[in-house]
């Protein structure tokens, strides 16, 4: 998954040039969160470019037209988060891509299912089938790859395989294929951001051409969630709105160029055990971007957030679009029938923001808030299974989840780190549709259980947004279905990237993660149109709730009943997630576990940094923040590598309830080497602004727990600087569990609200 | 059982344009890459560019850039080559070839392109 | 361009095994390459065998596998039989396109 960024950055390929197809992705993806409700923002599916091999063709040579670049996470070799200098994924040597490191972006990707794999076998249409995984619904519709936690679309699987990220550039860096993908299609960035200028690759002209003039561009890889299916070749966006294709930026794992990888082939960065089985899930009617196709991806939870860095969001549409990383499923898994709506809304995944520092426009006389608004997707439900009530009273403003094709969700699978085999399809497409009346309003994450890959859902809202439904895995223990509380499983595996895109070097200022369009095996971009304005009745209950599990019972009592301490300083706590030395690839996707040592937080850094699989940060991170009084403004996530992430293992959840948190020092947790996030041509990069989170007391940040910091604001704030959340990513958890002194926090800060009466 | 069918043999002139189809049927169209590769008599194959119906996502040989158009009809699960300003050297076999999982497992019957005065 | 070569042709006996080989020119095969091997029999009849080096396209024989052997792609039958005697053909992906080998004749008398 792109790694969120405070900077938009191009990642660019480490070769040079990944097979980047024509679809250019636009900026960072970014999630916005409605304040209503958290909305998806299409993880833009094109594929990583893959750099050159020595014995590569021509960079460029081939180019894609592709109207979606699948996501990054096609590159089976492990992307590194180079956009920031020094930001490397820790631990993770950077190693690049060589050619066809991606089967997606070699147009060979896995397909969400292995259903039409064996010769003579009829293949399953995933689509035709509607498949409840452990208490997860999935809509009918292709099975997704939700590798796209954020956004929609295997590969990932949520979307499509797409190419594996390519390392980022600093923006303007990145090297464009010129012979790579002819034009990328842009997400529907109207949807998004309305008025902001696309940047990305032509749409798609009739006849699926791609309109001339973004010929040669290069993909740019958008901050995106991978954790959407990345595995799945890019899905097609059919313009849902304004005609415009929406570009989901999932990333697959790594897998061959131009082939979907039917069978779940154990990379590195893939996932080891891709589920071959696919639920085919029917998309909700309505119009919405191509289906995503699920695609197999390991069980594991990996967190998306996706915050949209300086994109101005417009409070008093819940339509915004929350990129929402689909969870790397099983191709079987669809998208759990989120009492929360998963991001409804499609992330203009290829938006390009000039800058991509700059915000989106806001209408005028609206708020904008810059505040990255982080989903999480919440596994485990209400025990109705619907999530709290302003979660089904958002379904009702959710439309129902539109195809505007079968667009695969990508959840790309994601090559063990190093991996080079991009033949896995990491985010085959699968249709992840999110029942309508699951309310928008909180994303589920579900982490990942075990290295069985779940495959990723992404849901296409009826307005034509790209859903990615959350890998089946059952909700992290502990998580509750509450209302707009969103739990991110530390852990999630990032969902496999989309597949790898055409060689073309991302532009600059665009992320290569995704650089390359998506492969075909990457899902397209996919148009997510904001979800609808979910009700007010929402706000009332957005309060910024940090709710850290007590690890005991009896601790939980203790904590409330602890005086508070001052918070252990998190500063200079940098927990890199994605980082070698926090990432442990497993077998079965490459899992990531990040263990953070230091307690502090206020360093941390969260870059979802290996691009070419940090599509597959299904869930990864995503957390869902209302920004109210919650100050995150110096946190900076960076979902850079997503590959390794998908094994994030969802940890403890915890919840901060408190009102308003000062997280003092800086908190970026990197997560995220990319190596295998290969997956994810296509795969987005995420940018995340830091925002500082003060704890005034030192907590332990453990990535590899999977807290869920759930921001609820009373009221969602017109407030125009909503920085204070903006930035937040928490690929990692904090684990308030470990830390008596944050829980006692929390627990006062509850107190505190409940006296307030928030 | 998976199957491409690719349209018939195809006459052309020097300097029009045709367009080959390939209809896939028993798999989910949009879940693979469909390539297509050119075979000329006495010569091996040579890979033309991939299209990935879902998104429409398309990679080419940049031989063949500016020669062929991939596109496909989700509705009709079918993928299109059109080949503008043919001359001699474009008369061939094109397949159209599935890809996933890292194979190109099913491949069109081919169609024949005579480009000829 | 990337020039993949294999043997022209070879030629082997039932119940024995064979394997065909695929260089690039641009070095070593790797993984990376998603070495792609298709059969084709008379009349234009192409099936893929082997995908991303080892992986075995569903329904195909498990006699065939694929693997790398030093720096080339190589694909093993065993115990070969009269219905293999085809032209195998290779196929290299190189970051941006795909570059396919000459094809190799297998004759299996």
């Known amino acids: 998954m792109a790694e969120p960024r405070q900077e938009f950055e191009v990642m660019e390929d480490h070769a040079g040039t990944y097979g980047l197809g024509d679809r250019k992705d636009q900026g960072g993806y970014t999630m916005h969160q409605d304040q209503e409700g958290d909305t998806d923002a299409g993880l833009k599916e094109s594929p990583l470019q893959t750099p050159t091999e020595d014995g590569s063709e021509e960079p460029g040579s081939e180019t894609s037209d592709a109207k979606s670049t699948p996501t990054a996470e096609d590159v089976t070799a492990p992307l590194v988060d180079e956009g920031a200098p020094g930001k490397q994924a820790a631990a993770q040597p950077h190693t690049e891509i060589p050619e066809g490191t991606t089967a997606e972006e070699a147009g060979i990707g896995d397909t969400p299912s292995l259903e039409d794999e064996a010769a003579g076998h009829v293949t399953q249409e995933p689509e035709s089938g509607k498949v409840v995984q452990e208490g997860f619904l999935r809509e009918p519709g292709p099975p997704g790859l939700s590798h796209q936690l954020m956004s929609g679309m295997p590969g990932a699987p949520l979307l499509p395989e797409g190419p594996r990220e390519a390392t980022r550039q600093p923006s303007g860096t990145g090297p464009e294929d010129t012979e790579g993908g002819r034009h990328a299609p842009e997400l529907l960035k109207h949807q998004l951001l309305g008025d902001l200028h696309q940047e990305g690759p032509p749409l798609k002209g009739a006849g699926g051409k791609e309109r001339p003039g973004s010929k040669e561009e290069v993909d740019e890889d958008r901050d995106v969630d991978e954790s959407s299916p990345q595995d799945s070749p890019p899905s097609k966006a059919s313009p849902a709105q304004d005609g415009r294709p929406p570009q989901t930026a999932a990333r697959e794992a790594t897998s061959i160029p131009g082939f979907p990888a039917e069978g779940a082939i154990p990379l590195p960065v893939d996932f080891l055990s891709k589920v071959s089985t696919e639920i085919p899930a029917s998309e909700p009617d309505g119009p919405s971007v191509g289906r995503a196709k699920g695609q197999d991806a390991p069980l594991e939870f990996t967190f998306h957030v996706e915050i949209t860095p300086n994109v101005q969001k417009e409070q008093a549409h819940s339509e915004e679009h929350l990129g929402r990383a689909a969870f790397p499923g099983a191709p079987g898994e669809g998208p759990e029938a989120r009492g929360p709506s998963l991001g409804e809304d499609t992330k203009e995944a290829d938006l390009p923001e000039p800058s991509e520092k700059q915000p989106a426009a806001a209408p005028r006389g609206k708020p904008v808030s810059r505040v990255p608004q982080l989903k999480a997707r919440m596994v485990s439900k209400s025990k109705d299974g619907t999530g709290s009530d302003d979660k089904k009273a958002k379904t009702s403003t959710r439309s129902s989840a539109k195809t505007l094709k079968n667009r695969p969700c990508l959840s790309p699978k994601h090559p063990t780190p190093g991996s080079s085999d991009p033949l896995i399809q990491p985010s085959s497409p699968a249709v992840c549709p999110e029942p309508p009346s699951s309310p928008k309003y909180v994303s589920s994450v579900t982490s990942r259980t075990g290295s069985s890959g779940a495959k990723e859902m992404k849901l296409k809202g009826a307005d034509g947004k790209t859903k990615i439904a959350t890998p089946r895995g059952a909700a992290p223990p502990g998580q509750k279905g509450q209302a707009n509380a969103t739990r991110i499983p530390a852990k999630t595996p990032p969902a496999p990237k989309t597949p790898p895109s055409s060689g073309e070097p991302p532009k600059s200022g665009d992320r290569s993660g995704y650089s390359s369009p998506g492969s075909p095996g990457t899902p397209g971009s996919r148009s997510r149109t904001p979800s609808l304005p979910t009700p007010p009745t929402r706000e009332p209950k957005k309060v910024a709730v940090v709710r850290t599990p007590p690890k005991s019972p009896s601790s939980a009592k203790s904590r409330l009943q602890t005086a508070p301490v001052p918070m252990p300083d998190l500063k200079n706590v940098k927990s890199k997630i994605g980082s070698t030395e926090n990432l442990k690839h497993q077998p079965g996707g490459g899992k990531v576990q990040i263990i953070n040592k230091k307690l502090d937080l206020s360093n941390v850094q969260s870059k979802c940094g290996s691009k070419d699989n940090i599509k597959h940060v299904p869930g990864g991170g995503s957390v869902q923040i209302v920004y109210k009084p919650v100050d995150l403004s110096k946190v900076t996530s960076k979902c850079g590598s997503l590959g390794n992430i998908h094994h994030k293992p969802g940890g403890g959840q915890v919840e901060v309830k408190s009102e308003k948190l000062d997280f003092k020092d800086r908190v970026q947790s990197k997560i995220g080497s990319l190596d295998n996030i290969t997956h994810v041509p296509g795969g987005g990069n995420k940018k995340i602004e830091t925002h500082k989170l003060t704890f005034r007391e030192n907590a332990k940040a453990k990535t590899d727990h999977g807290a869920e910091i759930v921001y609820k604001s009373p009221v969602v704030s017109g407030d125009t600087s909503p920085r204070h959340l903006s930035n937040v990513s928490s690929t990692g958890s904090i684990d308030m569990v470990d830390s008596p002194q944050l829980a006692t926090l929390a627990d006062e800060v509850s107190a505190s609200l409940a006296k307030q009466g928030l | 059982q998976v199957q491409l069918q690719q349209s018939g043999t195809e006459l052309a002139k020097p300097g029009a344009s045709v367009k080959l189809s390939c209809k896939a049927s028993?798999?989910?169209?949009?879940?693979?890459?469909m390539h297509w590769i050119k075979q000329r008599p006495g010569q091996g194959l040579e890979w033309i560019g991939y299209?990935?119906?879902?998104?429409?996502?398309?990679k080419y040989n940049q031989n063949f850039r500016d020669k062929a158009t991939l596109t496909a009809d989700e509705s009709s699960n079918s993928a299109y080559m059109q080949l503008n300003s043919l001359t001699y050297e474009d008369s061939a076999v094109y397949y159209c070839?599935?890809?996933?999982?890292?194979?190109?497992?099913?491949w069109g019957q081919g169609t024949t392109l005579t480009v000829s005065s | 361009q990337a020039v993949v070569t294999q043997e022209s042709a070879l030629t082997t006996s039932p119940g024995e095994t064979v394997t065909l080989t695929c260089r690039s020119s641009?070095?070593?095969?790797?993984?990376?390459?998603?070495a792609n091997w298709v059969q084709e029999k008379p009349d234009h009849l192409f099936t893929g065998l082997i995908g991303?080096?080892?992986n075995r396209a569903p329904g195909v024989p498990a006699r065939f596998s694929g693997s790398l052997i030093g720096d080339k792609a190589a694909l093993t039958i065993t115990g070969a039989q009269t219905e293999d005697e085809a032209i195998y053909f290779c196929?290299?992906?190189?970051?941006?396109?795909?570059?396919f080998g000459g094809g190799t004749k297998l004759t299996v008398l």
């Open positions: 070839a599935r890809a996933g999982n890292r194979v190109f497992d099913f």
């Open positions: 028993g798999y989910t169209f949009t879940h693979y890459w």
């Open positions: 299209i990935y119906p879902t998104n429409d996502y398309t």
């Open positions: 641009t070095g070593a095969v790797t993984t990376s390459n998603f």
């Open positions: 991303g080096t080892n």
């Open positions: 196929a290299l992906w190189y970051s941006n396109l795909w570059v």
